[in-house]
Every structure is written in structure tokens, then in C-alpha cells.
């Protein structure tokens, strides 16, 4: 369906409000350091141009691609060279190379100040004074900090953000109403960003086939009553949506996502019985709801897979005729029977099956060769089951904070070269798997835990890719997408690591720690723990626990003291000396 003017087509499909919001997100995700006002100006210029094209699709430049139009606009930024350095070189390239160049310069960890939440009254005044600017600012700040955030989903977050302020700014107790809602949006937003980052990494680093395999497995678990052909169609459409969003084609992505939601709702009878409520909602809520919908019940009767995938004399013939279709059917049939497995486990099983067929279909007696293929699945299934059982027991014994600390020590010993902030952030998130997943019954634990861990380990991978410091991290991140977690789990203490020089400054604390929130205080303590392990990687659990207990007591004592700063200075020296002695430094 070729349109004379792509920009006019998208403007008409999406409407002015969504068009402007998506262009702002796109620009902020590309030029993450540009001031808000500059972006608003660029967006307004693009919007005015789009309107001229809606009026007359034959008008000058209206036939240009969106990449060309947006790229040209970004390249008009006067401070491009001094703000972004070599990214300015992208502007010398032609499309599509220019867009690829912009994509490569997206920064997962931009050097931006932490977002500080103003007082509730200040926020409510700003919201009432200029609602439109207030909401645009939200889109801008999230998009520039999360350059792969799923744009149509960010529109949904913005809608909820607006609803929170509309409701709470007229409540009797504004803070009690608003702050929990903002906390929820922040936490959900971070989770949404990380999930989408994994999808983009899957597409960009491992290709469309890897993403499609993931989608077949997940959609087959979610829609076990749908036919394979239906799942395949949904996978194709979903792949297109995510390829577009990950590629910066946000207008096309949002448009296609809306079309996909419409298709799913029009065909829900042949997809899932769980979609009814979702499909009654407005567009943004509908798309979000479909993406989060619970798994449908399995069909009443499903035969053993053995007949079609092991015992049939046509296994090798079917495989040879259309390898990916046959493997897709295997994955579909396996996944719809196993909502209790993680997607990554299902993909490992499919890979094992593929490897077996590759080997056996070339053998003298193929059937004899692959007859026991499902026996090879047993250890693959039991490994995550056992790991989750052990870690949930540890979590239940320790609680979240101490469980995070156990993981901090474990991962710092595995990859001590990784920066301390990254180790703290990743280990804290790994530790959240306990409260997120261990409460579930066994049948839901593995999909919850292992698929969540895949998301968190991808954060480690993308942060490490920016400044690679560990061959072991590079190896686990790049060899196999589905084996990342087992790869990291299998890492032992890095014996090649030369311990870091002791630096007293790292363990010097000040009275400002007393005014921090509980979460920020935990991060301070966990930062110190990582540094301790980097200084003394062979320290035992008991030694580290003793030092951390002393540290907690020291902070508590000095925060109660009248002269806090003096206490931190004097007691701090004693603590450092005692810690050095305890660890044999």
C-alpha cells in the first residue's frame, strides 16, 4: 500500500497528538543530550511540514522517506559536533546508512543528571499552568534516558501519568494520592524499558530468526488454542512492529501495533478466550492489555509429541522440506503444552532438537539416531528447576536485601572487572527475582524467574558492550542469547583477577548518608560491599558479613550522634582499620 507521502499517511493514521508525541520520542531517543526546547522546536517544524503534506501530498519534499525527513531535521542542530562528537559524522552519510549511524550512537547509559522529583505542589502547579508542556517534558525525559523504550507503550505511560496528576492535584492529600502512583509508573517504566531492550538486542545482535523463535514460544504459551498458522501470522506481524520500533521507525511501529491489536480483537475467537476484556478498552490500554494478557487454558486434549516429532517415519523428510517451519511447529507444540517452562528453556529444547536432526538426518539410520532425543531434554529442564529451587530457598531465608548482597558477592567474584555501579544495579535487579517470582506456585516460577533474569542479564550485556572490560562477560553475552543465564551461572571465581589497590577514600562516608532514603542507603552499602570484594576476592562469606555488620552499626551510630560529621570522620578511620584487619588487607 504505497502512499504518495509517507509523512502525510502517518499523520492521518495516528492523529496530530500521537504524531507529535512519537516524533518527540524519536528525536529524544536519538539526540539524548539536546535541551527540551530544541526538541520541541524541531517537532513543531516537522508537524507543520506534515500538515502541508496532508493538504497536498504532491507538495515539495512530501514524497521523501521519514528517515530522510527526520534525519535532515536532526542534522540541522547547530551544536551537533560539540555535543555529540563523532555522531555528527552521521550527517555526512546518505540514507539508510545515516539512520544506522544514528542508531549505533544511541547510549544506554547517557551521562544525564538523575531525575529528581520536585515537591508535589510544585508539580501540580506546573501541570495546571501548562499541561501540554508538562506531559511533553515527561516523554522527553523518559525517552532520552531510555533510548529503546517501546514508543507506543510510552504513550500509554504518559496517559497514565496525566491521569494521575488530573486526579491527585485536586485531592485533599495530594502527596498521598500522587506519590504511590508515580512510584508505580517509575518501577513499571523501568521494567518495560528493560524488556524492550532485550527485544531490540535480540533483533539487532542475533537477528530476526532469534526474535521470531522467541515470539513463537511466548505466543504459543499465551494462546495455546490458536492454530499454528494463526500464531505464525501474529509472530510475523509482531516481528515487524518490534523491528520498526527498535530501528527508530516509531510512527510505522505505532501504526502497525494498532493494526495488530485490531486484528487480534477481530479474530479473538480463533486466538484466545482471555482477550474479551482487553478488546473493550481504548487503543493504548487495549494494546498494553493484550501484551500482558494471561495464558489461555490449554486445549482439553493434546497428544504426545512423540508421534509427530520422533516416531513418524517422515521426521527427516518434513525437516528437510522446510526446516524453519518444522522447527517452528515443534516449538509451537512444545510451548503450548508447557506454560510452566521459561521461553529460554523452550528455545534451548528446540535448539537441541534441531542439532539432533541435523546430525541424525544425515546418519545411516536416522530414526535409531534420534529415537531418544527427548532424553536429552531432561538435564536441560532440571537445571533451571534446581537453580530456582535453591535460590528461592536462599531468598526466603535471607530476605531481599541480603539476597541481593549474596548475588553482589557472587557476581563480583565472577566478573570483578565490571564497573561497581553496573554490578550494583544488575545484582540488585537480579535479587528482585525473589520477591517477584518465588511467591508463585511451582508451575509459574520458571517462566517468571528465568525470563526475568534474561532481561536483567541483557542490561549487563548492553552496559558492558559500551565499555568492554571482561572477556567472560563478552563471551556469555555474545555466544548464545538463550544460554546467557546458564553461561553466567556456570562462571566460577575469576582466578586471573588482580585485586584492586586498597583506597581508603572509597570507604569514607559523610553525614549526608543519614538523609538518604532507605533504598539509597542500601545502594551505598552495596557499593562498599562490591569494592570490598574487588579488594579481597577470596574473602569468605563470614568475613564479608562481619565487615558489613560493622559498617551498618557504624552508620547507625553516627547518624544518631550530635556531631555527625566528626563521628563519621573518627569512627570511619577505625572502621577502615578494623575492616582491613578482618580481611587481612
Amino acid at each position: 500500500d504505497a502512499h504518495k507521502s509517507e509523512v502525510a499517511h502517518r499523520f492521518k493514521d495516528l492523529g496530530e497528538e500521537n504524531f507529535k508525541a512519537l516524533v518527540l520520542i524519536a528525536f529524544a531517543q536519538y539526540l539524548q543530550q539536546c535541551p527540551f526546547e530544541d526538541h520541541v522546536k524541531l517537532v513543531n517544524e516537522v508537524t507543520e511540514f506534515a500538515k502541508t503534506c496532508v493538504a497536498d501530498e504532491s507538495a515539495e519534499n512530501c514524497d521523501k522517506s521519514l528517515h530522510t525527513l527526520f534525519g535532515d531535521k536532526l542534522c540541522t542542530v547547530a551544536t551537533l559536533r560539540e555535543t555529540y562528537g563523532e555522531m555528527a559524522d552521521c550527517c555526512a552519510k546518505q540514507e539508510p546508512e545515516r539512520n544506522e549511524c544514528f542508531l549505533q550512537h544511541k547510549d544506554d547509559n547517557p551521562n544525564l543528571p538523575r531525575l529528581v522529583r520536585p515537591e508535589v505542589d510544585v508539580m501540580c502547579t506546573a501541570f495546571h499552568d501548562n499541561e501540554e508542556t508538562f506531559l511533553k517534558k515527561y516523554l522527553y525525559e523518559i525517552a532520552r534516558r531510555h533510548p529503546y523504550f517501546y514508543a507506543p507503550e510510552l504513550l500509554f505511560f504518559a496517559k497514565r501519568y496525566k491521569a494521575a496528576f488530573t486526579e491527585c492535584c485536586q485531592a485533599a492529600d495530594k502527596a498521598a494520592c500522587l506519590l504511590p502512583k508515580l512510584d508505580e509508573l517509575r518501577d513499571e517504566g523501568k521494567a518495560s524499558s528493560a524488556k524492550q531492550r532485550l527485544k531490540c538486542a535480540s533483533l539487532q545482535k542475533f537477528g530476526e530468526r532469534a526474535f521470531k523463535a522467541w515470539a513463537v514460544a511466548r505466543l504459543s504459551q499465551r494462546f495455546p488454542k490458536a492454530e499454528f498458522a494463526e500464531v505464525s501470522k501474529l509472530v510475523t506481524d509482531l516481528t515487524k512492529v518490534h523491528t520498526e520500533c527498535c530501528h527508530g521507525d516509531l510512527l510505522e511501529c505505532a501504526d502497525d501495533r494498532a493494526d495488530l491489536a485490531k486484528y487480534i480483537c477481530e479474530n479473538q475467537d480463533s486466538i484466545s478466550s482471555k482477550l474479551k476484556e482487553c478488546c473493550e478498552k481504548p487503543l493504548l490500554e487495549k494494546s498494553h492489555c493484550i501484551a500482558e494478557v494471561e495464558n489461555d487454558e490449554m486445549p482439553a486434549d493434546l497428544p504426545s509429541l512423540a508421534a509427530d516429532f520422533v516416531e513418524s517415519k517422515d521426521v527427516c523428510k518434513n525437516y528437510a522440506e522446510a526446516k524453519d517451519v518444522f522447527l517452528g511447529m515443534f516449538l509451537y507444540e512444545y510451548a503450548r503444552r508447557h506454560p510452566d517452562y521459561s521461553v529460554v528453556l523452550l528455545l534451548r529444547l528446540a535448539k537441541t532438537y534441531e542439532t539432533t536432526l541435523e546430525k541424525c538426518c544425515a546418519a545411516a539410520d536416522p530414526h535409531e539416531c534420534y529415537a531418544k532425543v527427548f532424553d536429552e531434554f531432561k538435564p536441560l529442564v532440571e537445571e533451571p528447576q534446581n537453580l530456582i529451587k535453591q535460590n528461592c530457598e536462599l531468598f526466603e531465608q535471607l530476605g531481599e536485601y541480603k539476597f541481593q548482597n549474596a548475588l553482589l558477592v557472587r557476581y563480583t567474584k565472577k566478573v570483578p572487572q565490571v564497573s561497581t555501579p553496573t554490578l550494583v544495579e544488575v545484582s540488585r535487579n537480579l535479587g528482585k527475582v525473589g520477591s517477584k517470582c518465588c511467591k508463585h506456585p511451582e508451575a509459574k516460577r520458571m517462566p517468571c524467574a528465568e525470563d526475568y533474569l534474561s532481561v536483567v542479564l541483557n542490561q549487563l550485556c548492553v552496559l558492558h558492550e559500551k565499555t568492554p572490560v571482561s572477556d567472560r562477560v563478552t563471551k556469555c553475552c555474545t555466544e548464545s542469547l538463550v544460554n546467557r543465564r546458564p553461561c553466567f551461572s556456570a562462571l566460577e571465581v575469576d582466578e586471573t583477577y588482580v585485586p584492586k589497590e586498597f583506597n581508603a577514600e572509597t570507604f569514607t562516608f559523610h553525614a549526608d548518608i543519614c538523609t538518604l532514603s532507605e533504598k539509597e542507603r542500601q545502594i551505598k552499602k552495596q557499593t562498599a560491599l562490591v569494592e570490598l570484594v574487588k579488594h579481597k576476592p577470596k574473602a569468605t562469606k563470614e568475613q564479608l558479613k562481619a565487615v558489613m555488620d560493622d559498617f551498618a552499626a557504624f552508620v547507625e551510630k553516627c547518624c544518631k550522634a550530635d556531631d555527625k560529621e566528626t563521628c563519621f570522620a573518627e569512627e570511619g578511620k577505625k572502621l577502615v582499620a578494623a575492616s582491613q584487619a578482618a580481611l587481612g588487607l
Epitope: M298, Y334, R337, H338, D340, E382, E442
Partner: nanobody
């Protein structure tokens, strides 16, 4: 949770028949694949037969095909194993198992609940 209790085992001559029953208590068994496994003295546990949730599909080990028949009555929360033309090599402790999710039917790791077993001895 599901508790499973097997019955019907005993001593029988070669060529004879037995009918094993597996009674479930707790959950409704209609959402579980039901299977029978056995362990002969000094051997590994092996798959015998399994039946899909509503009974539409059955699956057998090659060694028992044509001799054993698995069935179920969901209203009675019971699964059965009719064993005909018994042989000495069928001597084993027979276990009933229930699997909420099962792709292969024959894999013990896909079953969540197990009975204590009932002994079948085939001897002249």
C-alpha cells in the same frame, strides 16, 4: 495438590491378566495427563503408558503395545491399566503419575505427582 493411590497388583501366571487402578484425591484429575511407569528389580524406572486429559489420546511403550490398555474415568477421579498376556519381564513395581503439563507423556520429569506403587509379579 493430588494424592495418588495404586491398587490391583498381585501375583499372576504368565499369559494372565490384571487390572491396576489409580485413585486420585485432592485436585480434579481432568486437567492432568495420567501415566503408568514401572521399576523392575535392579533396573531403572521405565515408562509404560499414558493417557491425555480427557482420554482422547493414549501412548504406550513398545514393550507393552497391544497387550496393555490405559483408560480413565474423570468422574471417579481414577485411571486404569488393563494388563493382558502378562510375561515374567513385566514383573515390577507399578507407579501411577499425574502431569499437569506434558509434551512427551513418556518422560518422568514431566509428571508432578506420584503414587507409592503396587507390586505386580508374573511367575509360574
Amino acid at each position: 495438590d493430588v494424592q495418588l493411590v495404586e491398587s490391583g497388583g498381585g501375583v499372576v501366571q504368565p499369559g494372565g491378566s490384571l487390572r491396576l487402578s489409580c485413585a486420585a484425591s485432592g485436585s480434579n484429575i481432568s486437567s492432568y495427563v495420567m501415566g503408568w511407569f514401572r521399576r523392575a528389580p535392579g533396573k531403572e524406572r521405565e515408562f509404560v503408558a499414558a493417557i491425555s486429559r480427557s482420554g482422547g489420546y493414549t501412548y504406550y511403550a513398545d514393550s507393552v503395545k497391544g497387550r496393555f490398555t490405559i483408560s480413565r474415568d474423570n468422574s471417579k477421579k481414577t485411571a486404569y491399566l488393563q494388563m493382558n498376556s502378562l510375561r515374567p519381564e513385566d514383573t515390577a513395581l507399578y507407579y501411577c503419575a499425574a502431569g499437569r503439563y506434558s509434551a512427551w507423556y513418556s518422560q518422568s520429569y514431566e509428571y508432578d505427582y506420584w503414587g507409592q506403587g503396587t507390586l505386580v509379579t508374573v511367575s509360574s
